[in-house]
C-alpha cells in the first residue's frame, strides 16, 4: 500500500478552521489523484469531503463542501472550515492514484483535530 503521512495533532483556530498537510509517497507517476477526508469518532467512520484533481491543478471540492485545498507535488494542503467542538475527532487522509494505471491507495494514520468553541462575549452595560 502507498504510504500517506499527516500530522498527529492540529488545533482549530477560533473561527473553527483547521489546516493540515497530507503527503503521499507515490510509487508511480500519477496524473489524476483523488483525496478523501474521513472522520473517525466512536468507531464510526464518515466521509467529510473528497476531491479528484489533475496534478498541477487546483483541488475542486463540491460547492457545499466544508473543505478547500491546494496541491503541490505529492503534498495536499487541506483546510476544513466551520468546525465546532462537537466535530473534534480523528480526521484521516485517504489518497488514491486514479490515472494512469495501476491504481494505488493509501490511508494516513489520521490527524486529531481539537476544536474549542469560543466563549461568548460577556454583555457590557
Amino acid at each position: 500500500a502507498m504510504h500517506v503521512a499527516q500530522p498527529a495533532v492540529v488545533l482549530a483556530n477560533s473561527r473553527g478552521t483547521a489546516s493540515f498537510v497530507c503527503e503521499y509517497a507515490s510509487p508511480g507517476k500519477a496524473t489524476e489523484v483523488r483525496v478523501t477526508v474521513l472522520r473517525q469518532a466512536d468507531s464510526q467512520v464518515t466521509e467529510v469531503c473528497a476531491a479528484t484533481y489533475m496534478m498541477g491543478n487546483e483541488l475542486t471540492f463540491l460547492d457545499d463542501s466544508i473543505c478547500t485545498g491546494t496541491s503541490s507535488g505529492n503534498q495536499v494542503n487541506l483546510t476544513i472550515q466551520g468546525l465546532r467542538a462537537m466535530d473534534t475527532g480523528l480526521y484521516i487522509c485517504k489518497v488514491e492514484l486514479m490515472y494512469p494505471p495501476p491504481y494505488y491507495m493509501g490511508i494516513g494514520n489520521g490527524t486529531q483535530i481539537y476544536v474549542i468553541d469560543p466563549e461568548p462575549c460577556p454583555d457590557s452595560d
Partner: antibody
Framework: EVQLLESGGGLVQPGGSLRLSCAAS????????MSWVRQAPGKGLEWVSG????????GYADSVKGRFTISRDNSKNTLYLQMNSLRAEDTAVYYC???????WGQGTLVTVSS | QSVLTQPPSASGTPGQRVTISCTGS?????????VHWYQQLPGTAPKLLIY???NRPSGVPDRFSGSKSGTSASLAISGLRSEDEADYYC???????????FGGGTKLTVLG
C-alpha cells in the same frame, strides 16, 4: 472475489460488427481503469483499448483506432467494446482486464472469417 | 514488433534459477512507470505474477521476484519447477501511446 465475465464474441464476416461486454463484480468497478487485451491464436498479448474510471481518458492501439470504441457504465459495473469494420487479423480471444491487467476474465473468442 | 523487448525463449533444469529480461524506453519503464509480470499457463488466461516492479500478489510463491533499473526490468524464478513451464509477459504504461504495452512474451521450458 473479483470476477470479470466477457460475452458477445462469435463468428462474424469481414467488415462486420460485434459488441463485447464485460460484467464485473467483487471490487469497486468505478474506481478502476479498465482495458481490453487480445491474443491471436498462437501469438502474444496485445493491449487493444483502455478507459479511465470516469471515462475521461480513452486510449486505443494503432491497429484498432477509428474502428473500435470503448465505453463503460459504472452504474451497471460493465465495460464494453464496440468493434466495427472487422478484419481477419482481429481474430483473437478478447480479455477484459481491470487496472493494469491485475485481474483477467476468461476471455471471449472473436473469429472474423468469410 | 513489441514496444517492450523480451527474449522469445528461456530454459532451465529443476532447481535452477532463470531470469527473463524486459527492455523498454524513456516513454515507459524509463519514465518511472511500474512494471508488471504475467504468467500464462497453456490453455488458460494470463495471471498477474508481479505487481509494481517487485510485489507479489497473495498466493504467488516467493520463488518469483521482480526488479527494475533504468529502462529495463527482470523477472527471476529460483528453484525452478516443472509447473513453471509457461509463457511470461511484462507490461507497463506508455506515455507516448497513452496506453498499456506488453512484451512479446518469453516461453519458459523446464528441461528434464
Amino acid at each position: 472475489e473479483v470476477q470479470l465475465l466477457e460475452s458477445g464474441g462469435g463468428l462474424v464476416q469481414p467488415g462486420g460488427s460485434l459488441r463485447l461486454s464485460c460484467a464485473a463484480s467483487g471490487f469497486t468497478f468505478s474506481d478502476y481503469y479498465m482495458s481490453w487485451v487480445r491474443q491471436a491464436p498462437g501469438k502474444g498479448l496485445e493491449w487493444v483499448s483502455g478507459i479511465s474510471w470516469s471515462s475521461r481518458d480513452k486510449g486505443y492501439a494503432d491497429s484498432v483506432k477509428g474502428r473500435f470504441t470503448i465505453s463503460r457504465d459504472n452504474s451497471k459495473n460493465t465495460l464494453y467494446l464496440q468493434m466495427n469494420s472487422l478484419r481477419a487479423e482481429d481474430t483473437a480471444v478478447y480479455y477484459c482486464t481491470t487496472d493494469l491487467a491485475r485481474y483477467w476474465g476468461q476471455g471471449t473468442l472473436v473469429t472474423v472469417s468469410s | 514488433q513489441s514496444v517492450l523487448t523480451q527474449p522469445p525463449s528461456a530454459s532451465g533444469t529443476p532447481g535452477q534459477r532463470v531470469t527473463i529480461s524486459c527492455t523498454g524506453s524513456s516513454s515507459n519503464i524509463g519514465a518511472g512507470y511500474d512494471v508488471h509480470w504475467y504468467q500464462q499457463l497453456p490453455g488458460t488466461a494470463p495471471k498477474l505474477l508481479i505487481y509494481g516492479n517487485d510485489n507479489r500478489p497473495s498466493g504467488v510463491p516467493d520463488r518469483f521476484s521482480g526488479s527494475k533499473s533504468g529502462t529495463s526490468a527482470s523477472l527471476a524464478i529460483s528453484g525452478l519447477r516443472s509447473e513453471d513451464e509457461a509463457d511470461y509477459y511484462c507490461a507497463v504504461w506508455d506515455d507516448s501511446l497513452n496506453g498499456v504495452v506488453f512484451g512479446g512474451g518469453t516461453k519458459l521450458t523446464v528441461l528434464g
